[in-house]
Amino acid sequence: EAAASPLSTPTSAQAAGPSSGSCPPTKFQCRTSGLCVPLTWRCDRDLDCSDGSDEEECRIEPCSDDCIPLTWRCDGHPDCPDSSDELGCGTNEILPEGDATTMGPPVTLESVTSLRNATTMGPPVTLESVPSVGNATSSSAGDQSGSPTAYGVIA
């Protein structure tokens, strides 16, 4: 799918929409550029609008092509390749390993979701950037750290 950049000319799949709400029902209007893109491009995890608005306020579907049990969603166990089943899990805070004063403020899964929606022209954000989920812990790439905790879900 072609991605619209701020200076790009609309492709055959994209059409200029001069004002808000001027796209036909089969199209989605990019917020900043006003371009109309196919509705099927909305929430497909590809950033087609230059401002990423086609990927904002999307319901996080765990595992794009696989139906997983609902009980696997937000259970602290990443089952999807992109860990999407553990994203957008409410206001559970992810407590970074190590000294929180040196790690900065806690990251929440909601902020990760926002970050994914705000990221321009990159892959979806995965939990690689998130230290832990629930009682799970993260072992940083290349190191041999890791704290012994049992799995669990924060209620």
Partner: antibody
Framework: DVQLQESGPDLVKPSQSLSITCTVT?????????WHWIRQFPGNKLEWMGY???????NYNPSLKSRISITRDTSKNQFFLHLSSMTNEDTATYYC????????????WGAGTTVTVSS | DIVMTQSPSSLTVTAGEKVTMSCKSS????????????LTWYQQKPGQPPKLLIY???TRKSGVPDRFTGSGSGTDFTLTISSVQAEDLAVYYC?????????FGAGTKLELK
């Protein structure tokens, strides 16, 4: 094809710690998948121990409480099992294994390494 | 934790015989959303790691002979070997792959008469 190979000590003394390495070839452990440890006791009982996900997330069997840690060295494409306070009951064959994506069963296994706990 | 109970613990069979073994789970493994049973069967021969045979209770892994059939739903599952071959002599394990911690049955050992 992805291959897993365990390496570690044959013998560990009681109260000591165990460290086992799983070397992965044919696939990057940071690409995706979760990378698990399962052990099999002399009576053939199988126990799931825990995993490290490609993202670095780890999860453990609560039965192992605070004794277990799974870490990795991405530069060597290896992940490790650390088990502290070993007792005779930890004598087992230790397997590293990997489930297919979006599943919780196991289709790729290492050959296993047998660890005996004895003084 | 989900407890997996296999029976019998051992079976003595003759080549060509039909064999069934049971696996019961202490909690249901059927997901109502996708109607899949999260129950897996493995075969293990001496000196080897377990080998995946059947997943989702009844789906044979590619390359597994069709004499192996998995059936059942909810909490009661069965592995059937329609005509036992010498190479089938092994220990068979079932696994809960629905809920962590993942748990295994104690196994059913298939022996030759």
């Amino acid at each position: 094809d992805v291959q897993l190979q365990e390496s570690g000590p044959d013998l560990v003394k009681p109260s000591q710690s165990l460290s086992i390495t799983c070397t992965v070839t044919g696939y990057s452990i940071t690409s995706d998948y979760s990378w698990h440890w399962i052990r099999q006791f002399p009576g053939n009982k199988l126990e799931w121990m825990g995993y490290i996900h490609s993202s670095g997330i780890t999860n453990y069997n609560p039965s192992l409480k605070s004794r277990i840690s799974i870490t990795r060295d991405t530069s060597k494409n290896q992940f490790f099992l650390h088990l502290s306070s070993m007792t005779n009951e930890d004598t087992a064959t230790y397997y590293c294994t990997r489930p297919p994506v979006v599943t919780r069963y196991f289709d790729v296994w290492g050959a296993g390494t047998t660890v005996t706990v004895s003084s | 934790d989900i407890v997996m109970t296999q029976s019998p613990s051992s079976l003595t069979v003759t080549a060509g015989e039909k064999v069934t073994m049971s696996c019961k789970s202490s909690q249901g493994l059927l997901d109502s959303g996708n109607q899949k049973n999260y129950l897996t069967w493995y075969q293990q021969k001496p000196g080897q790691p377990p080998k995946l045979l059947i997943y989702w209770a009844s789906t044979r892994k590619s390359g597994v002979p069709d004499r192996f059939t998995g059936s059942g739903s909810g909490t009661d599952f069965t592995l059937t070997i329609s005509s036992v071959q010498a190479e089938d002599l092994a220990v068979y394990y079932c696994q809960n792959d629905y809920t962590y911690p993942l748990t295994f049955g104690a196994g059913t050992k298939l022996e030759l008469k």
